[in-house]
């Protein structure tokens, strides 16, 4: 199947991806076309835009040329200037600022906690199955199978540290070689990037916001996929990661030291352990073929236990099973021996919600999955709302300048590397790349950070998570120290190699272009985002897993033709865009294929048909929520929530007016402006920090 043309161009003409739109009017209250060169992308930035989405009110303005949808929007400052405020207004403004900061930190805290609970939920739902993936003996001989197992397990348990720790314990127990573990680690790296992609889906309401957020999140995915695409064959051929890490491990005489510091967990753990606590050892035990673990619950019941070593008389089937001949006897009926038995005495139960419910793991997992996704979504909406109200005018300018501006010439190239270090440092502090990249996603969405700047931050995050793993390895007990350190180093050098491949030379920054391409498609066809998620993180790995189980001949038999078609399509696409004259007229575009094979339009029609019946109730629900939100925020009565979004979209699209999907992330002031209701906000409602 040929690729859809939208994939080819990361920065296409918006007429390509704006349904029914040929031009667009940027929302600029002062009607100026002033540009702002604070951005390292060196593209014009209009003072204010919500591209390519619109307020539901038609803005009568002269048609102008469409701006680049990847430009950062200038968040309009609708507040009174500080100098124009009276003393009471200033005090109120300060308190309002402090209140917003507290709220922001609060929602950020619950956002991180919900990510932790989400990981626990995934482990409860798919942890045991994930553990069983590891017990497949073919991993040793098939690196591709190892890779997809790494992806699937990490996706199922929503934690690369869990899958990595399983691999470490398996290597330490000689159930797995370091060579066989490397592809699993690569897969775990891919799997961990799903979290921020899920977070990006929460911003689906606003097309332009979603475009940026989704591209910002998937830049991580593409970096990992492309790194694996190049480095896995290199590793299989040369075993460079294994060799380099072995040399490092053998050249140092490590002593296992202190535990790796738990920085963010110190704050989040007291809350998350009231929700649920898991016995992570169960998944590892299943991975190691421990039959008894299959019937154990992952939900931890006893938090305080006393383990006592005692000598006990135990029966054995024959003398051969005796501890030693002198420690064996018969009572005439059975043969007995004396063994050291660890007797575990339960002292105190855990203090989480599910401790006394005795629900099956799947039920607890589903409950937590729903709750954590709702909390995650709610927190994200509130974070975006608060940031939207705080990051206006001069504040936004200062922040955007700080984050997105390069160092002066000739040190501009250093900016990205500093961003990598910042990303690594921040990830080390929060002890999770998922948390860091997920926190980054809404900031990209609302336009605080460009994708070009988010990319090195994400790469740094990948490095940060491996330094955490190295520290954890150094703190591990003697029997697992070598293997855990070697695997952590493999992870580290894999990410370093990936950065060297896809960052230093701007031309090689393919993940940015690919992510922008995907962002454009997903903004136009929002269902494609979920489709992408399912295909890349579930279907492809599961298919490869299935084919690998069938054996090499089947895998090669199916894989080679598929890879050949993909290469053929890519080459054709490259020739179509670079030198179409080389190709015969028929191959200069994809029109020779049926429409469904080179465009998403027919697919969109099919999906719309299926999702149609669900849009009305969903819309009504959205309207109710929106009304509540409007009441809380003090929106006018004529807030667009009062009319069902579906009717609005259909009606306005019929008139050729592009519509902005009803979304709770909107700037209230813009809505008022659009409805001709702009009034000077009194000091009670609106406030600007500078």
């Amino acid at each position: 199947m040929a690729p859809w043309p939208e994939l080819g161009d990361a920065q296409p003409n918006p007429s390509k991806y704006l349904e029914g739109a040929t031009s667009q009017q940027p929302i600029t209250p002062d009607k100026s076309k002033e540009t702002n060169k604070t951005d390292n992308t060196e593209v014009p930035v209009t003072k204010f835009e919500l591209l390519p989405t619109y307020s539901t009110a038609t803005l009568i303005e002269e048609p102008t040329e469409v701006d680049d949808p990847w430009n950062l929007p200038t968040l309009q400052d609708s507040g009174i200037k500080w100098s124009e405020r009276d003393a009471k207004g200033k005090i109120l403004c300060v308190f309002q600022g402090i209140g917003r900061l507290i709220l922001l930190l609060g929602f950020l805290y619950f956002f991180v906690c919900s990510l932790d609970v989400l990981s626990s939920a995934f482990q409860l739902v798919g942890g045991k199955m994930a553990g069983q993936f590891f017990s497949n003996s073919s991993i040793m001989s098939n690196p591709l199978l190892g890779l997809v197992i790494g992806v699937l397990v990490t996706v199922f348990v929503q934690s690369s540290s869990t899958s990595t720790s399983i691999v470490v314990s398996m290597v330490a127990s000689s159930l797995l070689t370091v060579r066989a573990a490397i592809p699993i680690i690569m897969g775990a790296n891919i799997g961990t990037s799903i979290t921020n992609t899920i977070v990006a889906l929460m911003q689906v309401g606003d097309r332009s916001e979603f475009r940026r957020a989704f591209a910002g999140a998937t830049v991580h995915d593409f970096f990992n996929w492309l790194s694996v695409l190049v480095l896995l064959p290199v590793e299989v051929a040369t075993h460079y990661l294994e060799v380099v890490t072995q040399l490092i491990v053998e050249s140092f005489h490590f002593k296992n030291g202190e535990d790796a510091p738990d920085l963010l967990k110190v704050i989040t753990k007291p809350f998350t352990k009231l929700i649920v606590q898991l016995d992570k050892k169960v998944i590892s035990q299943i991975a190691m073929n421990d039959e008894t673990a299959k019937n154990k619950s992952l939900v931890k019941i006893w938090c305080k236990t006393f383990t006592n070593m005692t000598q006990m008389n135990v029966t054995v089937p024959s003398m051969a099973n005796c501890t030693s001949p002198s420690l064996c006897w018969t009572d005439g009926i059975q043969i007995w021996t004396m063994k050291n038995v660890t007797y575990k005495e339960n002292i105190a139960k855990c203090q989480h919600i599910f401790v006394n419910f005795h629900l099956p793991d799947l039920a607890v997992g589903i409950i937590l999955l729903i709750i954590s996704l709702l909390v995650l979504c709610g927190c994200l909406i509130m974070i975006v709302k608060i940031l939207g109200s705080v990051l206006k005018g001069q504040v936004a300018t200062v922040i955007k300048k700080t984050i997105n501006t390069d160092f002066p010439f000739p040190f501009a190239w250093l900016t990205g590397y500093l961003a990598i270090l910042v990303g690594a440092g921040m990830t080390f502090i929060v002890q999770s790349s998922s948390v860091f990249t997920s926190a980054l996603t809404p900031l990209i969405g609302i336009g605080v950070i460009t994708i070009e700047r988010a990319y090195p931050l994400t790469l740094g995050s990948n490095i940060g998570t491996t330094t955490t793993a190295i520290l954890a390895a150094l703190a591990s007990p003697g029997n697992t120290l070598r293997s855990s350190l070697q695997i952590a180093l493999c992870h580290f050098f894999f990410n370093i190699s990936g950065i060297l491949l896809w960052y230093p030379i701007p031309f090689t920054r393919l993940p940015i272009r690919m992510a922008k391409g995907l962002g454009n498609i997903s903004a136009k066809y929002r269902w494609f985002a979920i489709f992408y998620l399912i295909i890349f993180f579930f279907l492809i790995p599961l298919t490869v897993f299935g084919l690998s189980l069938a054996g090499w001949p089947v895998l090669v038999g199916v894989g080679v033709p598929v890879v050949f078609i993909i290469i053929l399509v890519l080459c054709l696409r490259l020739l179509q865009s670079r030198c179409p004259r080389v190709l015969p007229k028929k191959l200069q575009n994809w029109n020779f294929l049926p429409l469904c094979m080179h465009s998403l339009k027919p697919w969109d029609a099919v999906i719309s048909k299926f999702t149609g019946p669900f849009q009305m109730p969903c819309c009504c629900c959205c309207r109710v929520c929106c009304r509540v939100c409007c009441l809380l925020c003090g929106c006018p009565k004529c807030c667009r929530c009062s009319k069902c979004c579906q009717d609005l979209e259909e009606g306005q699209e019929a008139q050729g007016v592009p519509v902005k999907a009803p979304e709770t992330f909107d700037n209230i002031t813009i809505s008022r402006e659009a409805q001709g209701e702009v009034r000077a906000p009194d000091s009670k409602t609106e406030c600007t920090a500078l």
Epitope: N313, S326, L327, C328, W329, T330, D331, G332, I333
Partner: antibody, heavy 121, light 107 residues
Framework: QVQLQQPGAEVVKPGASVKMSCKAS????????IHWVKQAPGQGLEWIGA????????SYSQRFKGKAKLTADKSSSTAYMQLNSLTSEDSVVYYC??????????????WGQGTLVTVSA | DIVLTQSPVTLSVTPGDRVSLSCRAS??????LYWYQQKSHESPRLLIK???QSMSGIPSRFSGSGSGTDFTLSISRVETEDFGMYFC?????????FGAGTKLELK
């Protein structure tokens, strides 16, 4: 005091079966293993098997599997040994002896007086 | 099965003599060895448990020693009531086995 009472003699026909008893007293019958030992006149001792009255577990020496069957009646604190297909070679003394608790090494602190089985036509 | 070999088969002594009866195991049995005395027309009586521990009510002239494969029952001063058969028994390995016995007789 601990006592194990056995009938002094049993006379049986060749090919027939005999069920001899061993009545225990002076201790908790279900807590200790009862062993059966064979002794030919002027010969050594040979272990036949054992039964744990607490749960009815039994164990037999390879030589006596199918030949001997051990049972216990908790209500009367009596252990039984049934010998099948008797021949003249089975005309020996059979002792019951109290072993130790379940799981403790087997040694016999208390013995019955023994039952002399005579196989004759 | 573990084979216990007792020697001598017969031991002729006079009262007041010191005697040693030997029991050798075909493989190591730790200290799971017991000594029994059986007088004519009587049931066996346990003398020594765990190779060296005397049972209560047993005269102090009886003592046991050894571990592994070689065991000895010693009678410091033989008295007339001590004559009879002496058997050793092991419970280290299933099944329980007895030695063929040593006959202690009056010289």
């Amino acid at each position: 005091q601990v006592q194990l009472q056995q009938p002094g003699a049993e006379v049986v026909k060749p090919g027939a079966s005999v069920k001899m008893s061993c009545k225990a007293s002076g201790y908790t019958f279900t807590s200790y293993i009862i062993h059966w030992v064979k002794q030919a006149p002027g010969q050594g001792l040979e272990w036949i098997g054992a039964i744990y009255p607490g749960n009815g577990d039994t164990s037999y020496s390879q030589r006596f599997k199918g030949k001997a069957k051990l049972t216990a009646d908790k209500s009367s604190s009596t252990a039984y040994m049934q010998l099948n297909s008797l021949t003249s070679e089975d005309s020996v003394v059979y002792y019951c002896a109290r072993g130790n608790n379940y799981g403790s090494p087997a040694w016999f602190g208390y013995w019955g007086q023994g039952t002399l089985v005579t196989v004759s036509a | 099965d573990i084979v216990l070999t007792q020697s001598p088969v017969t031991l002729s002594v006079t009262p007041g003599d010191r005697v040693s009866l030997s029991c050798r195991a075909s493989q190591s049995i730790g200290n799971f060895l017991y000594w029994y005395q059986q007088k004519s027309h009587e049931s066996p009586r346990l003398l020594i448990k765990y190779a060296s521990q005397s049972m209560s009510g047993i005269p102090s002239r009886f003592s046991g020693s050894g571990s592994g494969t070689d065991f000895t029952l010693s009678i410091s001063r033989v008295e007339t009531e001590d004559f009879g058969m002496y058997f050793c028994q092991q419970s280290n390995s299933w099944p329980v086995t007895f030695g063929a016995g040593t006959k202690l007789e009056l010289k």
